[in-house]
């Protein structure tokens, strides 16, 4: 039985230019977690994150995305174009998997405020 | 056009160390991981370690984990297996392996090096 | 450590027809599972990856499927060119293993 929960940032939002900390937390389970996968949007690959092999990182991110802090992700140098929805899938052992749900704005104004909060999506 | 170029065959005796160089061409080598795979005369092939050319961080299989050492050169992009303490059952071909885009696979190999152990 | 079988050992087809290559893996691994060809005296060539996406350049009559612990490469109309020696290998822990191998050849 799946007794998990996913805990996220949530809706986020960061300033052009800068750099944001995609973050997702399992809990209430004992699970080993042996995977964290990040995708973007368009469920494209952003990076995995092996309990064994470590980190890979999609090559066409690897200069603008750096692995953690922790299973989660940094994202740098942000442009309009990473704003929409970011996952991350936990897969664990023996429970199977869990799935979490982050929004991220990137506003062009000088006085976006990175707000980020832990919520369950 | 993605090429991975394996240094020449060897000849060690037993208890002598090797290092395999495997030269990448045909893309941004730091943004690719390198993979070393070794194949036993007849035999199947075997997964020895990983490397991250941009940070060099490795991981490596167990069973190898004493014996060798991955790195890599940045400026001639350049990846390097060194396998130590040589025994008879290290005769094999040697190859290096490109990760791919989406995961820990490999999407190119080198053309692959034989060493020979033998006294 | 993850452990890979592959079955059938070998297999002769005739041109034309399909050859069906069966990989099962010791414990769940979802989706990550490749294949590779491996022709004599050749490097292992990528044909599939993420049990079912079909690497750059490899022709359609190849196809892979499954999920969990069990896997099959398809090449649906054999072709000469792909006499080699197939190899699945799964790409989620440490070790990566790869199975055995299977030998396909002409009938």
């Known amino acids: 039985m799946m007794t998990g929960t996913i805990e996220t940032t949530g809706n986020i939002s960061a300033k052009k230019g800068g750099s944001v900390i995609l973050q997702c937390h399992l809990s209430s389970t004992m699970a080993q977690v042996t995977q964290v996968n990040w995708e973007q949007h368009d469920h494209s690959l952003l990076a995995i994150r092996n309990a064994e092999l470590g980190w890979h990182i999609y090559p066409a991110f690897k200069d603008r995305v750096a692995p953690g802090p922790g299973l989660g992700l940094t994202l740098q140098s942000l442009t309009m174009n990473d704003t929409g929805e970011y996952f991350c899938t936990y897969h664990t052992y023996p429970d199977g998997t869990y799935r979490g749900r982050i929004f991220l704005e990137v506003l062009e104004s000088s006085v976006a405020e990175h707000s980020a909060r832990f919520q369950i999506p | 056009e993605v090429q991975l170029v394996q240094s020449g065959a060897e000849v060690k005796k037993p208890g002598a160390s090797v290092k395999v160089s495997c030269k990448a061409s045909?893309?941004?080598?730091?943004?690719?991981?390198m993979h070393w795979v070794r194949q036993a005369p007849g035999q199947g092939l075997e997964w020895m370690g990983r490397?991250?050319?941009?940070?060099?961080?490795?991981k490596y299989n167990e069973k190898f984990k004493s014996r060798v050492t991955i790195t890599v050169d940045k400026l001639s992009s350049t990846a390097y297996m060194e396998l130590s303490s040589l025994r008879s059952e290290d005769t094999a071909v040697y190859y290096c392996?490109?990760?791919?885009?989406?995961?820990?696979?490999?999407?190119?190999w080198g053309q692959g090096t034989t060493v020979t152990v033998s006294s | 450590d993850i452990v890979m079988t592959q079955s059938p050992d070998s297999l002769a087809v005739s041109l034309g027809e399909r050859a069906t290559i069966n990989c099962r893996v010791s414990?769940?691994?979802?989706?990550?599972l490749a294949w590779y060809q491996q022709k004599p005296g050749q490097s292992p060539k990528l044909l599939v990856y993420n049990a079912k996406t079909l690497a750059e350049g490899v022709p359609d009559r190849f196809s892979g499927s499954g999920s969990g612990t069990d896997f099959t490469l398809t090449i649906s109309s054999l072709q000469a060119e792909d006499v080699a020696v197939y190899y699945c290998q799964h790409h989620y822990g440490n070790p990566l293993t790869f199975g055995p191998g299977t030998k396909v050849d002409i009938k």
């Open positions: 045909g893309y941004t080598f730091t943004n690719y991981y």
């Open positions: 490397i991250d050319p941009d940070s060099g961080g490795s």
């Open positions: 414990e769940n691994i979802y989706s990550y």
């Open positions: 392996a490109r990760e791919g885009h989406y995961g820990f696979y490999s999407d190119y």
